[in-house]
């Protein structure tokens, strides 16, 4: 017990008070008269005397009180066992109960805690993501403007090392233009020297041509009968073609016609006898325009039309518009065959796309898709692709269904932003998507966590920058 | 040159809604609707020209300005030549004049646009 206190009341009454935690129990216990020694009654209204009693009453009384008190003693020892009984029964009622109450108030706040928690996860989650999309976006910004500013900072640098060696140019031409005049005055005189011997000369060789002329007239008549046996020759060359055209149209009929000297693609240069890797010059269709491509003969039984490849940095891809259409580079290393050239050609018959790529560990892998083309430029040179097979990802990294082609001055993507301008070169970019074969090219050491770089997302991940790409074609029948 | 012109703008107090069409017509022989992506912009007085909303040729795909984002919404009759800015929950920052965009070739054709004003 936390506390017991014994007192009297008004009355005569003894009350014992029992505390035990917040609860406080109080019991009125009558006087016990029946406890008192029958030898000795007690007066409850005797005068208190002056002088002290005998001593053998006096003892007799203590006996007397100390019964009593012996009395009090086990009647209270007994009170306290039956109060700790009650108490514990009541107790362990009073925890039920309270436990029962208490458990449903916490099932309930419980619930309500999880439901708040719940929502402000949703919220957070909702939050993160747009922290996450500004964040993105704003690296990339940041990324655009540090790249800028350091293109800046070598284009001032360079510039002003032209312009201290211009200066020394300057002064070098000065020395020589002062040089060249006292050159000049000396080389006149020699030139009127050499005139007077010219004018010599020009006299004799009047006379040389005179007797040419007379030679020439002979020559003129030996030439007309030479002339008309050329004539008669001719005429029996004809007669003979014509006598073999005949009869051999009707053996083969390909021999009459004229040799193909133009080809659309590299399937039709590999098909006439030229299976050698190498620039060739293809022919637009339905047109006389021409366009110079790399055609790979031995990858995969020949015959592909290179139309991107990055190996080395050294050409820029971030190009405009008009750049992209009738495009730019070096066929025999970097470039872009051109937008128009490839819309014409896969709108004319069906072709497959292959993409090769290699990373900086050594690895290579492919996507090939079996049916390939380009819209007009009307709609923007938008990209068209069906069943992907290969090994650089299950899931196409170029979004299907295709995007419009965006360049740093044509932005046709699906995105607020401006795909090609923050992740640099033009590709059919969605918002923006996961692949940029045009991005910037990074060297080995250099070429992770970049956005802008050449990215073949279900390959190497986004931030993974290739070491090399080439994209080919080939009409699907080949 | 493809025709566009942009009905349902008016004067409307916050909290209010408008729905805003764009009929295209005008494109090249051979040429449909349903082959171009179309665009939702608009510009606010003093303001720089803002990118609203995009959708695909073939009305799958949308996207939006972080702005407008949960309030408005883009679709496209491919039918009827049409396109629709849904807006619901109007502020008085959505005042601005609203123009439908095409890009072909990679040259833009814009509508004259509609005047929306939000005000108490």
């Known amino acids: 017990y936390n506390n017991f206190r014994k007192s009297m009341d008004s009355i005569g009454k003894k009350q014992y008070q029992v505390q035990h935690g917040s609860c406080s129990y109080t019991f009125l216990l009558p006087e016990m008269d029946n406890c008192r020694s029958s030898s000795s009654p007690y007066v409850s209204n005797a005068v208190q005397r002056d002088a002290p009693l005998e001593y053998d009453d006096s003892v007799q009384r203590l006996q007397v009180l100390e019964n009593i008190m012996e009395n009090n003693t086990q009647w209270l020892m007994k009170l306290e066992n039956y109060i700790q009984d009650n108490m514990k029964k009541e107790m362990v009622e009073i925890q039920q109960n309270a436990v029962q109450n208490q458990t449903a108030v916490m099932i309930e706040i419980g619930t309500n805690l999880l439901n708040q928690t719940a929502e402000q996860t949703r919220k957070l989650t909702d939050v993160e993501a747009q922290v996450l999309n500004q964040t993105t976006r704003l690296e990339l910004q940041l990324l655009e403007h540090s790249l800028s500013t350091n293109k800046l900072e070598k284009q001032i640098l360079d510039q002003t090392s032209e312009i201290n060696k211009l200066q020394d140019k300057n002064s070098f031409l000065e020395k020589k233009v002062l040089a060249m005049e006292d050159k000049h005055i000396i080389q006149l005189q020699s030139i009127k020297e050499e005139k007077d011997q010219l004018q010599v000369l020009v006299s004799k060789q009047n006379s040389i041509i005179e007797e040419l002329e007379k030679k020439i007239v002979t020559a003129t008549v030996n030439n007309s009968v030479l002339q008309k046996q050329q004539h008669d020759l001719m005429e029996t060359v004809n007669n003979l073609l014509t006598m073999m055209s005949t009869s051999n149209s009707a053996k083969d009929p390909t021999v009459a016609k004229e040799e193909q000297i133009s080809f659309r693609d590299c399937a039709e240069v590999f098909k006439s006898g030229h299976t050698t890797n190498g620039i060739y010059t293809l022919t637009f269709p339905n047109s006389t325009e021409e366009i110079k491509a790399y055609c790979d003969m031995e990858a995969g039984g020949g015959g592909w039309t290179i139309i991107q490849r990055r190996e080395d940095g050294s050409v820029d891809f971030q190009r405009t518009w008009k750049e992209y259409k009738v495009g730019f580079g070096n066929p025999s290393g970097e470039y872009w065959l051109g937008n128009e050239f490839v819309s014409q050609l896969t709108n004319q018959q069906r072709y497959v796309l292959k993409i090769h790529l290699k990373d900086w560990e050594g690895n290579e892998a492919y996507s090939l898709y079996e049916h390939f083309y380009l819209s007009s430029e009307e709609l923007n040179y938008r990209i068209h692709l069906k069943g992907l097979t290969g090994t650089a990802g299950k899931i196409s990294s170029i979004s299907q269904p295709g995007n419009d082609f965006s360049t740093k001055d044509g932005d046709n993507d699906k995105c607020i932003c401006k795909c090609s301008q923050m992740l640099t070169g033009g590709w059919w970019f969605d918002a923006c998507g996961p692949s940029n074969l045009n991005g910037m090219y990074y060297p080995q050491r250099q070429n992770t966590n970049k956005f802008n770089g050449i990215k073949w997302y279900y390959w190497k991940g986004s931030g993974y920058s290739l070491k090399a790409t080439t994209m080919m074609i080939r009409p699907a029948d080949f | 040159e493809v025709q566009l012109v942009e009905s349902g703008g008016g004067l409307v107090q916050p909290g209010e809604s408008l729905r805003l069409s764009c009929v295209a017509s005008g494109f090249p022989s051979g040429f449909t609707f349903s082959d171009y992506q179309m665009y939702w912009y608009r510009q606010a007085p003093g303001k720089e020209r803002e990118l609203v909303a995009i959708i695909s040729n073939d009305g799958l795909r949308k996207t939006y300005a972080d702005s407008v984002k949960g309030r408005f919404t883009i679709s496209r009759d491919n039918a009827k030549n049409t396109m629709f800015l849904q807006m619901n929950s109007l502020k008085p920052e959505d005042t601005a004049v609203y123009v439908c965009?095409?890009?072909?070739?990679?040259?833009?054709?814009w509508g004259q646009g509609t005047q929306v004003t939000v005000s108490s």
């Open positions: 965009n095409v890009r072909r070739a990679n040259r833009d054709d």
